[in-house]
Amino acid sequence: MSSKYPRSVRRCLPLWALTLEAALILLFYFFTHYDASLEDQKGLVASYQVGQDLTVMAAIGLGFLTSSFRRHSWSSVAFNLFMLALGVQWAILLDGFLSQFPSGKVVITLFSIRLATMSALSVLISVDAVLGKVNLAQLVVMVLVEVTALGNLRMVISNIFNTDYHMNMMHIYVFAAYFGLSVAWCLPKPLPEGTEDKDQTATIPSLSAMLGALFLWMFWPSFNSALLRSPIERKNAVFNTYYAVAVSVVTAISGSSLAHPQGKISKTYVHSAVLAGGVAVGTSCHLIPSPWLAMVLGLVAGLISVGGAKYLPGCCNRVLGIPHSSIMGYNFSLLGLLGEIIYIVLLVLDTVGAGNGMIGFQVLLSIGELSLAIVIALMSGLLTGLLLNLKIWKAPHEAKYFDDQVFWKFPHLAVGF
């Protein structure tokens, strides 16, 4: 099997990516400058550590989590890094243009990078549904469209619904999931005869996927608390996320065993379900008043995740062409919705004293916010899917799906590397 790109893609990718990079450099040159206000080193280090945690989550966590395919592990990790690097650059500019541009130049702070990394994480969640079926040139398009759509969604939600940074970023779970699923729906689905083995998982890649899950598990409290305003909020968010992910691990492993006729544990279930609690508490992690509530949420999220992993892949594989091991999309869509529902419940409890009219109005606003996130995700996802189907990108042939050798140079072109 050839290890080279098709010639047209070899011409297309470097030209497309490097032109884009040059354009980004020019935009940074003309429109950005660093924050010049004084801040002592200790403050900077503390602020940078949060950004560092998010980068570890994105590069190592999500990079390795998606690397469980037998023949597509290299591409999963490296393409993730490529998308993260590109996504962060574009997200910094976009966030700056949308929020500060009228005042002149875009001021870059450590918070800008933190926010941009979280925006880029959205792409890394979505791409799980399409990795192995697209090339890098197509992924560049996906990054640009998704980061733009998320940035605009966040600005609209912030302006119309007056939500804070945390609340409008926590739509990322639902947004990323539905975006990824709608892109997958547009791509060619059936795997031709003889390629079924490629979307199966293998032991070593599965181990690296578990490593990715562990990194995400360790740093999820940082993600959920990164955009909160006060120390008490961050403390509560960290504690509640930790309790939730701890319980979802126990639930995932035991639930996976329970779901198997011989009581065996499924790697695929565990990879994804260990994170379930973190996604489910995301929206309300700082508001949960006691540990046991966070733990119950972690339990419910773990069960939903395992249940979803058992029953949804068949449907997703048929309808969306998503391989069995790429369960992040529907997992996050279910758990993200659970998180949003929990927040709506809190909102109802909060407005009880303010009269029935007030309850209806607040709930309507919250449902409107969620619906907007889903609609924009689906529409921009479909648009991306249609763009990715254009012939100019020279998408991999279905026979070359989930194959590292299409993209990478290997010294020994062995099939079972």
Partner: antibody
Amino acid sequence: QVKLLESGGGVVQPGGSLRLSCEASGFTLRSSGMHWVRQAPGKGLEWVALIWFDGSIRSYAESVKGRFTISRDTSKNTLYLQMRSLSADDTAVYYCARDKAVRGISRYNYYMDVWGKGTTVTVSS
Amino acid sequence: VMTQSPSSLSASIGDRVTITCRASQSIIRYLNWYQHKPGKAPKLLIFAASNLQTGVPSRFSGSGSGTDFTLTISDLQPEDFATYYCQQSYSRPFTFGRGTSLDIK
């Protein structure tokens, strides 16, 4: 004892600049968000700017955006407000205040629990 | 927008005084009350609509939710003559009411 002490006020010409300082004692700026609030003669209180406890976010009132910059030096435990392109509308007593949060059911309630006595800024030709 | 009423109020020592604050949209219970005397630092009285700040006398109380809130001083003392402000913390920016000036009758 928790205290805030503002300084740096004075008379300045329209279009001029001024830097206000607010020295905190009894607590550390590293663990507290801080506000600047002003009161123009004969008017009510008007929120001006906020800096988060970790310095990561600065928010401004529309009336001062692009002209005022809130910053801090945690080694000196001091908050600053750099004011540029001043106009007569900026004439006021400027107060610094500590940001505090208490958990509500669906969000946090933020309030200003400690205030300084204020420093007067007069913009006049 | 926070609308305070009345804008000024005259009362006698020992009176029960009520100041109201109305929000243009529901702010649930995310409202604070401050007392301000000329030449002094403003002082937090009530946070989250009804919670008394530490050190504030119990004659001050806050109530209300949604759009209508009240600050009540049950037994007016000489040191209570000042200007009172409500402030919402439900959404940015953190707007104050125009103030109610309380003076001796």
